[in-house]
Interface confidence: low
């Protein structure tokens, strides 16, 4: 770090004084400060001298030296008070331009830190700052005025308490710009229009600026429409509405239409799409397939797309059977709008049993009329399987019952021993029977089917098995004969009903 | 289950006002969905939709016959009443009522004929 | 108001043949058609709705199909007792409106 003599802070001289300061670093080095005159410059290698026999209260400032070399980039500072009693400022700048919200720095340098606790900003003729500025004061730099707005565009003056009487500075005028971060802010309302044909409809197209020179106009089809603009300021921002009024929609107003504003930044454009129907409608869909199945115990939601136009008078969820007479609750049902014409409407079903089978029908009504959506839904479940000893034809028959949805498939085993269900090891034989007898299969129910399997001998110590299974899960039901030969006793009367 | 039995006079005179009850059992007017009809049969002729009253109570007419028609319904008696004002001889027909859902009419009455004459 | 029309208005058959009925709307009306059955001195009887769907009861002999503005009702194989007048009806917009209807006898 480059080190300056006097190792001092700052520096308080009388004008006519002499003053030399130097700076040392370890290679080349440079002085930068306040631009000013007298000052001559002496460098020798590694030191820079810079000098004058004459110090005005222009030399007043801070001054920097630097190594260029320095890959750290030090430096050191000094600050000169060139200590004038006729002129406590030296004004560095007349003119700051900042943009808004910056800081913007009022650069007046106080000659005389003795002076410091008197100072204050005014703008020019004595008037006093506007209401909400926020200032700050360094005597090196001079007034800060934090975050500053437009409004705050004016001429200042830096005073300071002489004897007793306030000294102004010449003034400084600062011009806060506005930040225009690029085209204007543009809203196009709505951003999606439908009428019927013979209804008003009303399109505005308004865009807004920190600046006011803007431009901005709403086209039809490409075409650029006449429209006459309204012209505001609120929120410190010009606005520019163009509100395109139709007082009968017919089919020619269809269409593209594009609210474009431009300014130095660029052009920005925004559309909308007007729709001219001949009549009211209302179009029910969903992206789900309307036959569901869905295996008892797991939820479903259930949801539908509707398009309409005018909106919606009513909607509902309804259960149509076959079984019980329960209708969803309102709870489940919900509803959420995409945009003005689009909605998506979800019932929810968590946990279902086996009475919440069938269809359910989503019900709309706007003036173009009613509209359903209906659903279908079947419940899977695993199979359930019970077997019975009977005669048929004079022969001891096992009679098989398996109930489930889909329809189960049925395999018969016969196992060693007496047991809850055969395994690998014990089993003697195994018959699928591929095309077991459909008892009952009504929409919305568990299919029924029935297989018989005809044995000559019921084996003593023997268990035979009928199983079921389907694409949720298995079922099963091991016979085991109370005693040998009881295919010798056919019952006197034989009624199944599965 | 579902039934729909219509009601009024079998004779009307040209001019007259007529008014047919439709009584109904096995559902509920006030049930979302839920609507009741008016259908007409002249004689050899086909059917010809009047009017349809929803559980909301909307109205809808058929186009022709809209400044002659009125339907409203009592929903705790289980009852539509249609009234057709300046009856004429054209007007003869079978009346019914059917219970619609969804727009379909799937439960129908046996239908009353009313016939205008002098 | 939509305007159905039906086609033929009338036809002869016998039991076993196979019928087809179709039906016209003036403006797409997607699937919202119903058929009914009437038989002489009754009220009409629902087929099918929703263009295709069968009521629950009815004969599978008994098959609807279409979308938009065509439409057909088609039975199968002719039973006795489907000897009747057939009508159509749009419920996709009000006033709901039905065909003029189509009448089936007996060869």
């Known amino acids: 770090i480059p080190v300056i003599e006097p190792s001092v802070p700052e520096l308080v001289v009388k004008p006519g004084a002499t003053v030399t300061l130097r700076c040392v670093g370890n290679g080349s080095v440079e002085w930068d400060g306040p631009p000013s005159p007298h000052w001559t410059l002496y460098s020798d290698g590694s030191s820079s001298i810079l000098s004058t026999n004459n110090a005005t209260f222009q030399n007043t400032g801070t001054y920097r030296c630097t190594e260029p070399g320095d890959p750290l980039g030090g430096s050191a500072a000094i600050h000169l008070y060139v200590k004038d009693p006729a002129r406590p400022w030296n004004v560095l700048a007349q003119e700051v331009v900042v943009f808004e919200d910056q800081d913007a720095l009022l650069p007046c340098l106080l000659t005389d830190p003795v002076l410091e606790a008197g100072v204050s900003l005014v703008r020019v003729r004595g008037r006093p700052l506007m209401r909400h500025t926020n200032y700050s004061f360094s005597p090196w730099h001079g007034f800060t005025i934090h975050r500053a707005k437009f409004i705050q565009s004016q001429d200042y003056q830096c005073s300071a308490l002489m004897g007793g009487r306030k000294v102004m500075s010449i003034s400084i005028r600062l011009k806060v710009q506005k930040v225009i971060p690029g085209p204007p802010a543009l809203t196009l309302v709505p951003a999606e229009l439908v009428r019927i044909r013979g209804e008003a409809a009303q399109i505005v197209c308004s865009a807004s600026s920190v600046d006011v020179n803007f431009d901005v106009f709403l086209q039809h089809n490409n075409t650029k429409l006449a429209i006459p603009q309204q012209s505001d300021f609120h929120n410190n921002r010009y606005q520019k509405v163009l509100t395109l009024n139709l007082d009968q929609v017919d089919f020619q107003h269809a269409g593209n239409y594009s609210c474009v504003a431009s300014n130095v930044q660029g052009k920005h454009s925004t559309s909308m799409f007007f729709r001219v129907v001949e009549s009211a409608y209302l179009n029910l869909s969903s992206e789900q397939n309307l036959i569901q199945e869905v295996t008892v115990g797991e939820g479903l939601n259930l949801k539908v797309m509707v398009e309409a136009y005018p909106g919606l008078q009513g909607f509902n969820w309804t259960y149509l059977g076959p079984f019980s007479d329960h209708q969803p609750e309102p709870k489940l049902a919900n509803a959420t709008t995409k945009d003005t014409y689009r909605h998506t409407f979800t019932l929810s079903l968590p946990r279902l049993k086996p009475s919440e089978a069938g269809r359910y029908s989503f019900l709309a009504r706007n003036p173009g009329g009613w509209r359903a959506l209906t659903f279908e839904l079947t419940l899977r479940y695993p199979p359930e399987v019970s077997v019975i000893w009977t005669f048929i034809n004079g022969s001891g028959t096992l009679l098989c019952a398996a109930s489930g949805y889909p329809q189960p498939n049925v395999t018969w085993l016969q196992c060693s021993g007496h047991t809850d269900r055969c395994d690998e090891a014990q089993v003697l034989q195994v018959w699928d029977d591929p095309y077991p007898e459909v008892l009952s299969q009504e929409p919305f129910h568990k299919v029924t089917v029935q297989s018989l399997l005809t044995v000559e001998t019921l084996e003593h110590n023997q268990t035979y098995e009928c199983r079921a299974h389907n694409s949720v899960g298995s079922g099963s039901w091991a016979f085991i004969p109370i005693s040998a030969g009881a295919h010798t006793h056919p019952p006197d009367e034989f009624l199944f009903t599965p | 289950q579902v039934t729909l039995r219509e009601s009024g006079p079998a004779l009307v005179k040209p001019t007259q006002t007529l008014t047919l009850t439709c009584t109904f059992s096995?559902?509920?007017?006030?049930?979302?969905?839920?609507?009741v009809s008016w259908i007409r049969q002249p004689p050899g002729k086909a059917l010809e939709c009047l009017a349809l009253?929803?559980?909301?109570?909307?109205?809808y007419y058929s186009t022709s016959l809209k400044t002659r028609l009125t339907i409203s319904k009592d929903t705790s008696k289980n009852q539509v009443v249609l009234t057709m004002t300046n009856m004429d001889p054209v007007d003869t027909a079978t009346y019914y009522c059917?219970?619609?859902?969804?727009?379909?009419?799937?439960?129908w009455g046996q239908g009353t004929l009313v016939t205008v004459s002098s | 108001a939509i305007r159905m029309t039906q086609s033929p208005s009338s036809f002869s058959a016998s039991t076993g043949d196979r019928v087809t009925i179709t039906c016209r709307a003036s403006?797409?009306?997607?699937?919202?058609l119903a058929w009914y059955q009437q038989k002489p001195g009754k009220a009409p009887k629902l087929l099918i709705y929703?263009?295709?769907t069968l009521q629950s009861g009815v004969p599978s002999r008994f098959s609807g199909s279409g979308s938009g503005t065509d439409f057909t009702l088609t039975i199968s194989c002719l039973q006795s007792e489907d000897f009747a007048t057939y009508y159509c009806?749009?419920?996709?917009?009000?006033?709901?409106?039905f065909g003029p209807g189509t009448k089936v006898d007996i060869k």
């Open positions: 096995g559902f509920s007017l006030s049930t979302s969905g839920m609507c």
């Open positions: 009253i929803d559980w909301d109570d909307d109205k």
């Open positions: 929703a263009a295709s």
């Open positions: 059917a219970r619609t859902q969804l727009g379909i009419a799937d439960y």
């Open positions: 009806q749009q419920y996709y917009s009000y006033p709901f409106t």
């Open positions: 403006q797409g009306i997607s699937s919202y």
